[in-house]
């Protein structure tokens, strides 16, 4: 299936160019999404070109500026909130970066009503976080991890928390592990759905070893950072719920959620809460041993100014195959009946599907079903549930979005999506506003995307919120690889693989290959999505093909496939990559003697088993920023598919799945090892422990670090390492520069 | 009802210890946070300490940082103010009173503390 | 710490008489935040208003609190014989929570 064809014709030919590598670097052929800030089931909020604040009614076709540019730069603002009541502005300056989704930032509140700045008990900076509450303008905010609560704007704060300290007790914010492996988020504060409470966790990190690296910056010392950080394994952070009256705060102060009975029994985590009314709020708990979560339903005892969180609302989730969830515990969808709710988990074919819960989860009904896999529940409404699935034409690596018709029975399913821009669109999220009046689908490919605003009614299109015409237009005299999606069968696996080929793709001739690799459980590479990146470039210029696979532990293909690598990572993974690469060469167009692999986090990892596999088939290849051992990750991620690196549970594996224990087998193959030495996430300690294995080997190979870069190598570090990386695999390749 | 009963107050010699309890009847105790106010003979209200309803977390004035302890056990619906190295500057009626730092809803009849040589 | 300022610090009213009570903040506080006690002597005091202006529970309505920021008024609208007392305003917006100095009513 060839979805993105080169347009290239012998009439045009000369004045078509290939892609550049500058082009990539400049980002010169990025695209743009649209998504409405929604404020109400018809208006919604967007920042123009020209910077201003605009809000707009779909119903009435008008807008206006709520907030000038002239607003805006007067603080040097980069991002901007509305309070609900549309009193106020909070304008975000001074952004600070932290890790993945943290960041601090300089906050001012800007008063709507008499265009002026609120002077008088302004806010301490820098903040760590802020938000509004759902109705109304009472701002909660993280200062020095401790929660301060303003029921207006210029009044003076209230603090919630006392007991923070920096890398102690983190209040409303997560420390490093939960913020990158268990909410995906900088917050860790809830307000209910009319502001009446606010729900906060309260982090412990006193007893978590701390990882140190040096920070070299430009002074006459480095200095250190310290981040509690478990390891698998290691002495994990110790969470506690807590919920206060935002009405009269300093009156009963907060009270603390209690954790289930069989989830207290040992280490355990919080995985999320979800308001359900400003009385009832459900909260998701997961053993350490990741294969058990309980959902916890509880209410408000206004008489005992409790939170009651009676053992029948407790709901378990079990996995027997594997973990609990995909990457993360789905969280549920409540109903309007505020007790019954949605849920997406694993069928008893193990498909991942949505479910609706009553009372038990035993009872529960299944709403979809098929071998295929429904992703996400964007909304329910009173007579439609919306969610996404890669169910149309049996792609795993499409997204449709569907309705389902729940006010009549049976429910009736449609597919929004799939016929919209069939060849254009076959990718899609959503974003709804109150009570799905309306949404915006933004579709990323396999075309240029485009970003679309529709009736929540009909479905009807109403405009085109970004279709991408300056880049369609620059890209019209660009040559483009060819690309396709196809799978492969092979012992009763399915390896769904992406091909990107150069534009006079010729079958009959040779081509050097790359494998671009990821990998890691319930990750998905294959998808179709538009990006011209350094591989559109390395296939367009360089005459490359470049191959991504999805083997053994990706997602949305069923358990068997997801769970396939429970307890030994760093087997199949492998295997199927090359197991691929043997498929290709069988297709005639592959160069066996000019055979590369490369992959960055979890890829790199990937990448550095598959050259040291003694295979013979890879000539080269590099590993960015890889894990080398499992010892030496995050204890939330990796016992979650590993268990824990203990004589009496995986210790045999943790030691057998390293890079470290290959090292000799490097010998034959040509290496790139690159890491920043300020990652914060996979520790440039994995990638010195394999330069000293194979310095120990005597195995020669190539390497290069990054200073004061975290796991992303971001600013000018991507240029030098991707001009880096084209240097290595063109001398691998005998490509002329 | 609600009732906050202090007991414990006497005479004691600077430098001394005591300790005060409060039996608290008529709500659910282990969900209010409490706390303790104190008022010097002819003078007005100061706030001494509070503590959430779990016990976990406590709060002092500075004037009684590092001499006092609040604590409580709510199997026994009981507060205790532990004060030790008396001053005569401690001298005072002391209150239990329901609620963190305001308001405080609820109060004891109190119990007298004289710290004198 | 916040200092609140009662004044006066004496009001000699007769009964029936409406009683105008101030407190006044050395930092704003938020209303949410005051309250006003009452306290008779040899008792212990009496929640009278919290949140500023919200009467407690079993207080008469001729009870009532006002203001925001650093100026907060107690009004005892018709002075009742059993109203004779001191009055204390309370902020618990910072911690320490503190009490102003108390305003004595006393019968003229």
């Known amino acids: 299936i060839v979805l993105r064809p080169s347009r290239v014709h012998n009439s045009e030919e000369n004045t078509m160019r290939a892609l550049t590598l500058k082009d990539i670097l400049n980002g010169t052929f990025s695209y743009k999404t649209f998504f409405p800030n929604w404020i109400s089931g018809q208006e919604y909020l967007h920042q123009s070109a020209d910077n201003n604040i605009v809000l707009y009614n779909i119903e009435t076709g008008q807008s206006y500026t709520i907030l000038s540019n002239r607003t805006m730069k007067s603080v040097n603002a980069s991002n901007y909130g509305l309070s609900p009541d549309r009193q106020f502005v909070y304008l975000e300056s001074d952004y600070s970066k932290l890790w993945r989704y943290s960041y601090t930032a300089t906050y001012y509140i800007y008063d709507l009503s008499n265009g002026e700045f609120v002077r008088g008990n302004e806010l301490p900076r820098p903040i760590q976080y802020l938000c509004w509450s759902p109705v109304g303008s009472k701002l909660a905010y993280v200062y020095q991890n401790n929660i301060y609560l303003k029921q207006r704007p210029g009044d003076p704060p209230f603090q919630i928390t006392f007991n923070g300290r920096e890398n102690k007790i983190f209040n409303g914010i997560p420390d490093w592990v939960y913020e990158e492996e268990m909410l995906a988020t900088k917050y860790a504060l809830w307000w209910s759905p009319n502001g009446k409470f606010l729900a906060y966790a309260e982090f412990n990190d006193t007893d978590i070893p701390v990882i140190a690296y040096s920070y070299y910056g430009d002074e006459q010392y480095p200095r250190t950072i310290n981040i509690p950080y478990p390891k698998a394994g290691a002495k994990n952070p110790v969470v506690r719920i807590f919920i206060i009256d935002t009405t009269y705060p300093a009156y009963v102060g907060p009270q603390e959620v209690p954790v289930p009975a069989m989830i207290a029994s040992s280490d355990y985590y919080f995985s999320w809460l979800t308001w359900v009314t400003d009385e009832r709020v459900c909260l998701q708990w997961l053993k350490r041993v990741q294969n058990v979560s309980v959902l916890s339903i509880c209410d408000f005892r206004e008489d005992w100014q409790t939170w009651d969180c009676p053992k029948t609302q407790e709901h378990i989730e079990e996995s027997r195959t594997g973990w609990a969830g995909g990457f993360f515990v789905s969280t549920p969808v409540f109903s309007y009946d505020a007790i019954s709710y949605y849920k997406i988990f694993s069928d008893k074919d193990g498909y991942k599907h949505i479910h609706y819960i009553k009372d038990t989860v035993e009872n529960a009904i299944q709403i979809t079903s098929g071998k295929w896999e429904a992703i996400n529940i964007f909304r329910v409404t009173q007579d439609s549930l919306f969610y996404s699935s890669n169910e149309f034409e049996e792609y795993p690596g499409r997204r449709n979005i569907y309705r389902i018709s729940i006010g009549s029975y049976p429910p009736s399913k449609k597919c929004v999506t799939c016929h919209l821009r069939k060849e254009r669109c076959q990718y899609y999220t959503a974003s709804f506003s109150d009570y799905a009046k309306y949404y915006a689908l933004v579709c990323y490919g396999p075309g240029i995307p485009i970003s679309t605003l529709h009736d929540g009614r009909t479905d009807q299109e109403i405009k085109i919120l970004e279709e991408n015409k300056e880049l369609e237009n620059a890209l019209k005299n660009i040559q483009l690889p060819k690309e396709e999606i196809k799978k492969l069968e092979v012992d009763e696996i399915t390896l769904w693989y992406k091909m990107i080929l150069p534009p006079q793709f010729d079958r009959s001739k040779k081509y050097p290959l790359l494998i671009q690799v990821y990998g890691g459980p319930c990750s998905q590479s294959v998808r179709s999505v538009f990006a011209v990146n350094w591989i559109s470039y390395l296939a367009s210029k360089e005459g490359m093909v470049i191959a991504l696979v999805d083997g053994r532990g990706t997602a949305f293909q069923g358990d068997k496939l997801l769970y396939a690598v429970y307890r030994k990572l760093g087997v199949y993974e492998v295997e199927d990559q090359i197991t691929a690469v043997r498929k290709f060469i069988e297709m005639g167009f592959i160069d066996e003697k000019r055979i590369a692999i490369w992959g960055w986090s979890y890829g790199g990892y990937v990448s550095s088993l598959a050259l040291a596999s003694g295979t013979g088939l890879f000539k080269c290849g590099i590993a960015v920023a890889p894990v080398s051992s499992w010892e030496y990750y995050a204890s939330v991620y990796t016992e979650r598919f590993m268990g824990l690196p203990t004589k009496d549970d995986n210790l045999e594996h943790y030691k057998n799945s390293t890079v470290m224990a290959r090292a000799e087998y490097f010998r034959n193959v040509d290496y790139l090892l690159i890491h920043g030495t300020a990652d914060d996430n996979v520790h440039f300690q994995n990638s010195a422990q394999i330069a000293k294995a194979l310095v120990n080997a005597q195995v020669d190979f190539q390497a290069m670090w990054y200073s004061d870069q975290n796991h992303g190598l971001s600013g000018l570090s991507t240029n030098h390492l991707y001009t880096h990386m084209t240097h290595f695999l063109k001398q691998c390749f005998s490509l002329s520069d | 009802e609600v009732q906050l009963l202090e007991s414990g107050g006497g005479l004691v010699q600077p430098g001394g210890s005591l300790r005060l309890s409060c039996a608290a009847s008529g709500f659910t105790f282990s969900s209010y946070a409490m706390s303790w106010v104190r008022q010097a003979p002819g003078k007005g209200l100061e706030w001494v300490s509070a503590?959430?309803?779990?016990?976990?977390?406590?709060y002092y004035a500075d004037s009684v940082k590092g001499r006092f302890t609040i604590s409580r056990d709510n199997s026994k619906n009981t507060l205790y103010l532990q004060m030790n190295s008396l001053r005569a500057e401690d001298t005072a009626v002391y209150y239990c009173?329901?609620?963190?730092?305001?308001?405080?809803?609820?109060w004891g009849q109190g119990t007298l503390v004289t710290v004198s040589s | 710490e916040i200092v609140l300022t009662q004044s006066p610090g004496t009001l000699s009213l007769s009964p029936g008489e409406r009683a105008t009570l101030s407190c006044r903040a050395s930092q704003s506080v938020s209303s949410s935040y005051l309250a006003w006690y009452q306290q008779k002597p040899g008792q212990a005091p009496r929640l009278l208003i919290y949140g500023a202006s919200s009467r407690a529970t079993g207080i008469p309505d001729r009870f009532s609190g006002s203001g925001s920021g650093t100026d907060f008024t107690l009004t005892i609208s018709r002075l009742e014989p059993e109203d004779f007392a001191v009055y204390y305003c309370?902020?618990?917006?910072?911690?320490?929570?503190?009490f102003g100095q108390g305003t004595k009513v006393e019968i003229k």
């Open positions: 009173a329901k609620g963190w730092f305001t308001p405080f809803d609820y």
């Open positions: 309370q902020q618990g917006n910072q911690i320490p929570p503190t």
């Open positions: 503590i959430s309803g779990s016990g976990g977390s406590t």
